[in-house]
Interface confidence: medium
Amino acid sequence: AVNGTSRFTCFYNSRANISCVWSQDGALQDTSCQVHAWPDRRRWNQTCELLPVSQASWACNLILGTPDSQKLTAVDIVTLRVMCREGVRWRMMAIQDFKPFENLRLMAPISLQVVHVETHRCNISWKISQASHYFERHLEFEARTLSPGHTWEEAPLMTLKQKQEWICLETLTPDTQYEFQVRVKPLQGEFTTWSPWSQPLAFRTKPAALGKDT
């Protein structure tokens, strides 16, 4: 960052999107600012308009191509600059040499579905979205189940230390409404972080058969 009160954080979704957040203490809300991306190995550059997301932070998405196109590799360096208009000129507010595969945050898993549900267990599957083929199987997942009367924050995390796009939830209560979420993270990258949580999948366990213990 150009000065100590500025914070500029970006993540690559591993395919064709770099999402950035810039925060600056004391910056004017109505200032027009952009993120400029200049890859060192590519014959393109890209710009996105920073839009306010809070009192002192702005965000934008650099769309590098079609969602599943592989636009960057592990040896690309993208110089990212925050440029803000000052009168008729542009002033550089922040800069970073962005290494895409060191700063990964994948898209949230999609297509969650109940494969099979019983009284005490439920098998759920999902798919990863817009994830690079470079990862092969080097991904991990976290999942959580929302039980009645609890919050998501209270839900214990289940970790899948391999690329496993399904889970069998055990020891559930019969005839009970649950919600399920999953997120994904590549093993690669010093500053890589978890994807957002998936949209919750609601399901209900089957009622216990009459005359049987629960």
Partner: antibody, heavy 119, light 106 residues
Framework: EVQLLESGGGLVQPGGSLRLSCAAS????????VHWIRQAPGKGLEWLGA???????QYNAAVKGRFTISRDNSKNTLYLQMNSLRAEDTAVYYC?????????????WGQGTLVTVSS | DIQMTQSPSSLSASVGDRVTITCQAS?????LYWYQQRPGKAPRLLIY???NLASGVPSRFSGSGSGTSYTFTISSLQPEDIATYYC?????????FGQGTKVEIK
């Protein structure tokens, strides 16, 4: 016209230090990555590291910790600081810049400066 | 690190001959470059991105290949082509070069 001019080479004793300079003209060092490459006498080329346009650096593990790349934007000059020099560091040292995109390879080279490490 | 192995390490050919140099990578690479280095001079870029001719380079030079196997060709050797030729990968860091192929005139 893009030009790179290395200087600072010479004779240094083992264990000593030396700072090489690479004066750039025809472009701004804040807009392009610049690399250091060396060639031992009668040998092939070895990539040492680079400083990117935003100022961050990348090194070959073979020299990381002993060699440091830096730059002075106001002088449009790059530096290679070499410490704890060994006989095997004897080489011609080049700075190089890719074309407008690195896909274009090392399109621009300096003339090289000779470093001799010997007692 | 990716090892780049050139063959032959040296060759002698007559003016007008077709000369071929191969470069084998220890693992698959996507971006390959070829340089010419005359004695006492800095390297000069000839081929970028596997097969593209650098600015001002004569069309007798060409490159091809993919994956781990690449080829550099001089279609008709000229006296000024006496030099050492290097391949280089830019698919992963550290960047690495082949050991060089010295080309001489018979």
């Amino acid at each position: 016209e893009v030009q790179l001019l290395e200087s600072g080479g010479g004779l240094v004793q083992p264990g000593g230090s030396l700072r090489l300079s690479c004066a750039a003209s025809g472009f701004s060092v804040t807009s392009y990555g610049v690399h250091w490459i060396r060639q031992a006498p009668g040998k092939g080329l070895e990539w040492l590291g680079a400083i990117w346009s935003g100022g961050s650096t990348q090194y070959n593990a073979a020299v990381k910790g002993r060699f440091t790349i830096s730059r002075d934007n106001s002088k449009n000059t790059l530096y290679l600081q070499m410490n704890s020099l060994r006989a095997e560091d004897t080489a011609v040292y080049y700075c190089a810049r890719a074309g407008d995109y690195n896909y274009d390879g090392f399109a621009y080279w300096g003339q090289g400066t000779l470093v001799t490490v010997s007692s | 690190d990716i090892q780049m192995t050139q063959s032959p390490s040296s060759l002698s050919a007559s003016v007008g001959d077709r000369v071929t140099i191969t470069c084998q990578a220890s693992q698959s690479v996507s971006f390959l470059y070829w340089y010419q280095q005359r004695p006492g001079k800095a390297p000069r870029l000839l081929i970028y991105d596997t097969s593209n001719l650098a600015s001002g380079v004569p069309s007798r030079f060409s490159g091809s290949g993919s994956g781990t196997s690449y080829t550099f060709t001089i279609s008709s050797l000229q006296p000024e082509d006496i030099a050492t030729y290097y391949c280089q990968q830019w698919s992963t860091y550290p960047l690495t070069f082949g050991q060089g192929t010295k080309v001489e005139i018979k």
